[in-house]
C-alpha cells in the first residue's frame, strides 16, 4: 500500500476580514492511525489552530465528521477572520504513539490572505 500523503489542494486563499475561511485538506490513506492537527506557520513558533484529539477550538469547525471511521477529509473552516489570522496553514497527520503522538506527514500549506473589510 502507498504511503499516506496529506493533500492541501489550495496554495492560497483570500478572505475578507470578518468572513469565514475554508482550508481544505485530505489524506490518501487511513493508515497510520492517528489524529490530524492544523497549524499556522512552521517550526517551533507555529500556532496550534485545531487538534482533532483534544482541546476546545471555538472558531474552528470541521467540514466533515472526523469521528466517522473512514473519513479522510480534514478540511476546516475558521470563522470571523482578522488580519492576525493571515499566514500559511499546515494540515499535519500524526501517528498514534505513547505517551505522545508523533508527527508523521505535513501538507504543503495553504496561504491565507486577509482583505480589509471595506468601510
Amino acid at each position: 500500500e502507498e504511503e499516506l500523503q496529506v493533500i492541501q489542494p489550495d496554495k492560497s486563499v483570500l478572505v475578507a476580514a470578518g468572513e469565514t475561511a475554508t482550508l481544505r485538506c485530505t489524506a490518501t490513506s487511513l493508515i497510520p492511525v492517528g489524529p490530524i492537527q492544523w497549524f499556522r506557520g512552521a517550526g517551533p513558533g507555529r500556532e496550534l489552530i485545531y487538534n482533532q484529539k483534544e482541546g476546545h477550538f471555538p472558531r474552528v469547525t470541521t467540514v466533515s465528521d472526523l469521528t466517522k471511521r473512514n473519513n479522510m477529509d480534514f478540511s476546516i473552516r475558521i470563522g470571523n477572520i482578522t488580519p492576525a489570522d493571515a499566514g500559511t496553514y499546515y494540515c499535519v497527520k500524526f501517528r498514534k504513539g505513547s505517551p505522545d503522538d508523533v508527527e508523521f506527514k505535513s501538507g504543503a500549506g495553504t496561504e491565507l490572505s486577509v482583505r480589509a473589510k471595506p468601510s
Epitope: 506557520g41 507555529r46 500556532e47 496550534l48 489552530i49 472558531r59 474552528v60 470571523n80 482578522t82
Partner: antibody, heavy 119, light 108 residues
Amino acid sequence: DVQLVESGGGVVRPGESLRLSCAASGFSFRSYAMNWVRQAPGEGLEWVSRINSGGGGTDYADSVKGRFTISRDNSKNTLYLQMNSLRAEDTAVYYCAKQYDWNSFFDYWGLGALVTVSS
Amino acid sequence: ETVLTQSPATLSVSPGERATLSCRASQTVGSKLAWHQQKPGQAPRLLIYDASNRATGIPDRFSGSGSGTDFTLTISSPQTEDSAVYYCQQYYYWPPYRFGGGTKVEIK
C-alpha cells in the same frame, strides 16, 4: 473548572531576578496560548508576554523585552516568567491568563502574584 | 498600534439605574473586543467577548454592543456587587494586546 494559580512573587532589590510560576488545571493546557499581564499599584492592566501552545513562539511588551523570558512545561501544566534586571517600575501584581483560542481574548485569569522591587 | 480609550473614568450610579460605559479604538478592531470586570483586590474576570457575547455565568444585565471603533458596555440594572473597574481589550491586531485605561463604576 479552569484554575490558574501563580506563585513565586516576593520582594527583591533593583537588578535582581525572580521567577514566577503559574500552575494550570481543568483544561488541555498544551492546546492553548498563555499570557502574563501585570497591574502596577492603582494602575490599569498591562500585557507583558505571550507564549504559543507548543512553547516555541513568544511575544513581549517593549517595556520588558530583553529582560523577561516566558516559557512553559506542557508535561507539568505550568507557565513561567523569568524576570531579570528588575526595576522599581516592574512592581506589580502579575496575572497569568489563558487565551480562548490562539488569536483571541483572555477567558480565564489567575489570582495574581505580587512582585515588589525596592531598595 | 491600536489605542483604546475608555470613558468616563469614573461612573457613579444608583442601584437599578442604567450604566453605560464607552470604549473607543484608534482604528477598527472589527468585533474583536472583550470586556473584563475587576473587583477590588480580585483578579479580572471576562464579561463580554466578540463585542456582544456574554461569557459563561455572566448575568444578562450585562450587555455589549458596537463594532469597528465604538463599543459600549451596558449594565441595565446595576447591583451593589457590580462596583468594579471595567476594562476593554482588543485582539484584532497584536502583539501587543491592548487594554483600555478602565472605567470605575461606583454604585451609590
